[in-house]
């Protein structure tokens, strides 16, 4: 569908099926008015997953999508969703008529705003192009983390961006590790933040017509060393039928590098515990947190022998944490089972007797078993 002086779908009626997916080529600078549903019950317009506001240069209002003057960054997919039901009434892709890369949905407006460019546009003060990426104003992060602030903007002429820290020009020269400025992404990145990085960071975006600014607040949380934290309720007691597959999940949170082991409590010579009172366990899986799937224990094609108590044991340089759950395996022919499995136990410390030897990573730990 090639558009001419004004792109307009009229009247504002429910679209026919063939209207639901369209591709519109729009000339730069051209006004756009698209309708979706009846005016009083018009749908909501979205671009890139964000609902369009009822005011502004690009607006969604009473079922109508209005763009005063089509710019390159307006290209992309627009959805009109029915109120309440979220049914897609319109699925439109707007394409810049003379852009070499018209299929992209977030073209850089810069190339179309340069004075040398063959097109001429009215001057425009800077404006935020992706305000949804700026919603998080306060960044409270642990020391050592990476922090990224963004202020994506556009305007004509193309605006420049500079950064302030606590009101002063900020170039990062006094910061260990410096800073990373990506002007094309309108971003400031600081790696391995420290408490002295705390403060108010301001992006100042300006061109000959005007300027806009936005403040971010950074708080750096000093790490308090602690043993791993395991998410409550995981692993969860599970009931499975013979032959089925089971996944036991263990979510581990740790500042220091954690190591995880999955253990199965076993019986040796008719006993679950050794003479010293420590339980017998078999190490099923061991790895560090960065290993694939370490937080999930997969049991394939389970049999009655797989029933029992399983423990997720996580340790770091500070200490150990563990949580346990019970797996109950039912025979295939028994479709109903109502008895409750024992509650998972959450305890602080643990020492395991093991038939195969715990990993070296735990050998330095002083672990005691407390029922």
């Amino acid at each position: 569908l090639e558009a001419s002086e004004e792109v307009e779908l009229e009247p504002c009626l429910a679209p026919s099926l063939e209207q639901q997916e369209q591709e519109l080529t729009v000339a730069l600078g051209q006004p756009v008015r698209l309708c979706c549903g009846r005016a009083e019950r018009g749908g909501h317009w979205y671009k890139e997953g964000s609902r369009l506001a009822p005011a502004g240069r690009v607006r969604g209002w009473r079922g109508r999508l209005e763009i005063a003057s089509f710019l390159p960054e307006d290209a992309g997919r627009y959805l009109c969703l029915a109120r309440g039901s979220m049914i897609v009434l319109q699925n439109l892709t707007l394409i810049t008529g003379d852009s070499l890369t018209s299929s992209n949905d977030d073209e850089d407006p810069k190339s179309h705003r340069d004075p040398s460019n063959r097109h001429s546009y009215p001057q425009q003060a800077p404006y935020w192009t992706h305000p949804q990426r700026m919603e998080k104003k306060l960044h409270a992060v642990p020391a050592g983390n990476t922090v990224k602030f963004r202020c994506p903007a556009a305007g004509n002429p193309t605006p420049t961006i500079r950064w302030l820290k606590d009101g002063q020009a900020f170039h990062g020269e006094n910061r260990i590790g410096g800073i990373r400025l990506r002007h094309q992404h309108w971003s400031l990145v600081m790696e391995s933040v420290v408490p002295s990085d705390r403060g108010t960071y301001t992006c100042l975006v300006e061109n000959a017509v005007g300027s806009i600014r936005y403040n971010y607040l950074l708080d750096v949380l000093e790490r308090s060393p602690h043993r791993p934290i395991l998410q409550a309720g995981l692993p969860a007691n599970t009931t499975a039928v013979v032959g089925s597959d089971v996944e036991l999940l263990c979510k581990v949170y740790s500042d220091a590098q954690p190591h995880i082991q999955w253990l199965k409590h076993i019986v040796i010579n008719g006993s679950s515990f050794g003479a010293d009172g420590f339980p017998y366990v078999q190490v099923l899986k061991t790895a560090d947190i960065n290993s694939s799937e370490v937080e999930v224990l997969y049991l394939r094609n389970v049999s009655a022998e797989d029933a029992g108590e399983y423990t997720c044991l996580a340790g770091n340089s500070i200490g150990l944490s563990y949580q346990s759950a019970w797996l109950t395996v039912l025979p295939e022919e028994d479709p109903t089972w109502t008895a409750a499995a024992p509650e998972a136990r959450y305890t602080d410390k643990l020492e395991f007797r093991h038939d195969s030897g715990l990993n070296d990573i735990f050998e330095a730990q002083k672990i005691e078993w407390h029922e």
Epitope: D106, D108, H130, R133, R182, H183
Partner: antibody, heavy 119, light 107 residues
Framework: QVQLLESGGGLVQPGGSLRLSCAAS????????MSWVRQAPGKGLEWVSV????????HYADSVKGRFTISRDNSKNTLYLQMNSLRAEDTAVYYC????????????WGQGTLVTVSS | DIQMTQSPSSLSASVGDRVTITCRAS??????LNWYQQKPGKAPKLLIY???NLQSGVPSRFSGSGSGTDFTLTISSLQPEDFAVYYC?????????FGQGTKVEIK
């Protein structure tokens, strides 16, 4: 349409050098940041380096820092990767990729060029 | 550097199945996460950018969700052409690290 075509791969001895090129067409090259991404045989993807559209910003993976240099010639619509002090672990298919504007997603990729470092 | 951990590393599924792949970052990365599909001998293909945005031309059965540290790629109804390796990639930090990949195989 957007096209990226890598060249310059081949067999090189450990300690040797190689220069990869990526010829771009179908878009305004200087408007886009470009990256190199590599993939060792049978392994996953590893990001190598990025350069901003005007060349004002570059960054490298720790594994190649000090050995590889990314550059571009916007007048020739070409991206380069100069690889020095090559090691066996640099053996991989090297892809050049274009970054989406406002994001660092690689929306277009070349077909790749194989670099083999072996004695 | 920020580490990305994908799970599972491989999975077997049938055509029509709903498939979910997860990716966890070692720190908060906001929504700076992309998903790619790669078939043998081919370059990767961008599916989802910035956690939840469907790349132009990608079928709507692919969707992404999550923010912070935990992200999910969902294929609502697996098609024969979807059997491939899937990678997540963070672009929050200057070094754009990838996950180790998830191979989706035919059951």
């Amino acid at each position: 349409q957007v096209q990226l075509l890598e060249s310059g791969g081949g067999l090189v001895q450990p300690g040797g050098s190689l220069r990869l090129s990526c010829a771009a067409s179908g878009f305004t090259f200087s408007d886009y940041a470009m990256s190199w991404v590599r993939q060792a045989p049978g392994k996953g993807l590893e990001w190598v380096s990025v350069i901003e559209g005007d060349g004002s910003y570059t960054h490298y993976a720790d594994s190649v820092k000090g050995r590889f240099t990314i550059s571009r010639d916007n007048s020739k619509n070409t991206l380069y990767l100069q690889m020095n002090s090559l090691r066996a672990e640099d053996t991989a298919v090297y892809y050049c990729a274009r970054e989406k504007t406002y994001s660092s997603a690689f929306d277009y990729w070349g077909q790749g060029t194989l670099v083999t470092v072996s004695s | 550097d920020i580490q990305m951990t994908q799970s599972p590393s491989s999975l077997s599924a049938s055509v029509g199945d709903r498939v979910t792949i997860t990716c966890r970052a070692s720190q908060d990365i906001s929504s700076d996460l992309n998903w790619y599909q790669q078939k043998p001998g081919k370059a990767p293909k961008l599916l989802i950018y910035d956690a939840s945005n469907l790349q132009s031309g990608v079928p709507s059965r692919f969707s992404g969700s999550g923010s912070g540290t935990d992200f999910t790629l969902t294929i609502s109804s697996l098609q024969p052409e979807d059997f491939a390796v899937y990678y997540c990639q963070q672009h929050y930090s200057p070094s754009h690290t990838f996950g180790q990949g998830t191979k989706v195989e035919i059951k």
